[in-house]
Amino acid sequence: LTCLGGFASPGPVPPSTALRELIEELVNITQNQKAPLCNGSMVWSINLTAGMYCAALESLINVSGCSAIEKTQRMLSGFCPHKVSAGQFSSLHVRDTKIEVAQFVKDLLLHLKKLFREGQFN
């Protein structure tokens, strides 16, 4: 067997694959959750039909020190065309409701599964 690791950069992930990988990571989080996710941290609820990826990142990026969602934060940063920093709320037009991270993840997962089923990979 030949090991090619490190020699060739992997090709860009097609949108459908990228979306599936994000769904798989969110499934992972919900299934492996034992204690309250991120110690029960609260984040802004988002409108899942309006510029969802950047808005989701803007909400979740304000949770620090929670290893369980670090991969999700990283993945979402690749799903947003502009750079998002903690405390930035450009895509989060309405900030009126806070929910627990666990609920946020569940809501996002349900919506992404629906998009995937409908073939909306954009």
Epitope: A18, L19, G51, Y53, H82, K83, S90, F121, N122
Partner: antibody, heavy 118, light 109 residues
Framework: EVQLVQSGAEVLKPGATVLISCKVS????????MHWVQQAPGKGLEWMGR????????KYAPKFHDRVTITADTSTDTAYMELSSLRSEDTAVYYC???????????WGQGTLVTVSS | QAVVTQEPSLTVSPGGTVTLTCRSS?????????ANWVQEKPGQLFRGLIG???NRAPGVPARFSGSLLGDKAALTLSGAQPEDEAEYFC?????????FGTGTKVTVL
């Protein structure tokens, strides 16, 4: 004043590699993604990829992913785009452009003409 | 890979209104495509006009507005000025990469 200043025109042979620089001023380099765009003669625009100068994380367009490398040097506030295995159809003007939510593609370099000819 | 198409050319009278559209081959354009509009004038730097579907870039006149129109992204120019004569490109975000549209040449006549 925000400025993006690119390196000069290049004439190269097929198979060669070109490295274009984009030196920025007037803002904090690491605060924004830098994108690169190609415009071939008489053609439209093609997005090539982008970099987060803070950590070097990149995204590339499917068309270019195996030949393009985007890097950033935070010590000089300069982004670089390297395109390898050049062919005649890579003859184009290449642009760096800053992108953010409030200023989408708001600032552009002056462009660098790359001519690939044997 | 998606293809993003625009009207090749449109003509508008000075003071008139024109709407440019941007269609995706993969289906309806949504807010998660973060539609962008860029202006190109000969001999000048490109200029970003609109991002995130409807956010005007700083310094862009209010006569330029972005929206979703049916299943497409749209750029509406209300009260066209002679200096608005240019090529306009849209760009749509597909989860992890942009694809630019074919471009629309707008003539103010």
């Amino acid at each position: 004043e925000v400025q993006l200043v690119q390196s000069g025109a290049e004439v190269l042979k097929p198979g060669a590699t070109v490295l274009i620089s984009c030196k920025v001023s007037g803002y904090t380099f690491t605060d924004y993604y830098m994108h690169w765009v190609q415009q071939a003669p008489g053609k439209g625009l093609e997005w090539m990829g982008r970099i987060d100068p803070e950590d070097g994380e990149t995204k590339y367009a499917p068309k270019f992913h195996d030949r393009v490398t985007i890097t950033a040097d935070t010590s000089t506030d300069t982004a670089y785009m390297e395109l390898s295995s050049l062919r005649s159809e890579d003859t184009a003007v290449y642009y760096c452009t800053r992108y953010d939510y409030y200023g989408p593609f708001a600032y552009w370099g002056q462009g660098t003409l790359v001519t690939v000819s044997s | 890979q998606a293809v993003v198409t625009q009207e090749p050319s449109l003509t508008v009278s000075p003071g008139g209104t024109v709407t440019l559209t941007c269609r995706s081959s993969t289906g309806a354009v949504t807010t998660s495509n973060y539609a962008n509009w860029v202006q190109e004038k000969p001999g000048q730097l490109f200029r970003g006009l609109i991002g995130g579907t409807n956010n005007r870039a700083p310094g862009v006149p209010a006569r330029f507005s972005g929206s979703l129109l049916g299943d497409k992204a749209a750029l509406t120019l209300s009260g066209a000025q002679p200096e608005d004569e240019a090529e306009y490109f849209c760009a749509l975000w597909y989860i992890n990469h942009f694809i630019f549209g074919t471009g629309t040449k707008v003539t103010v006549l």
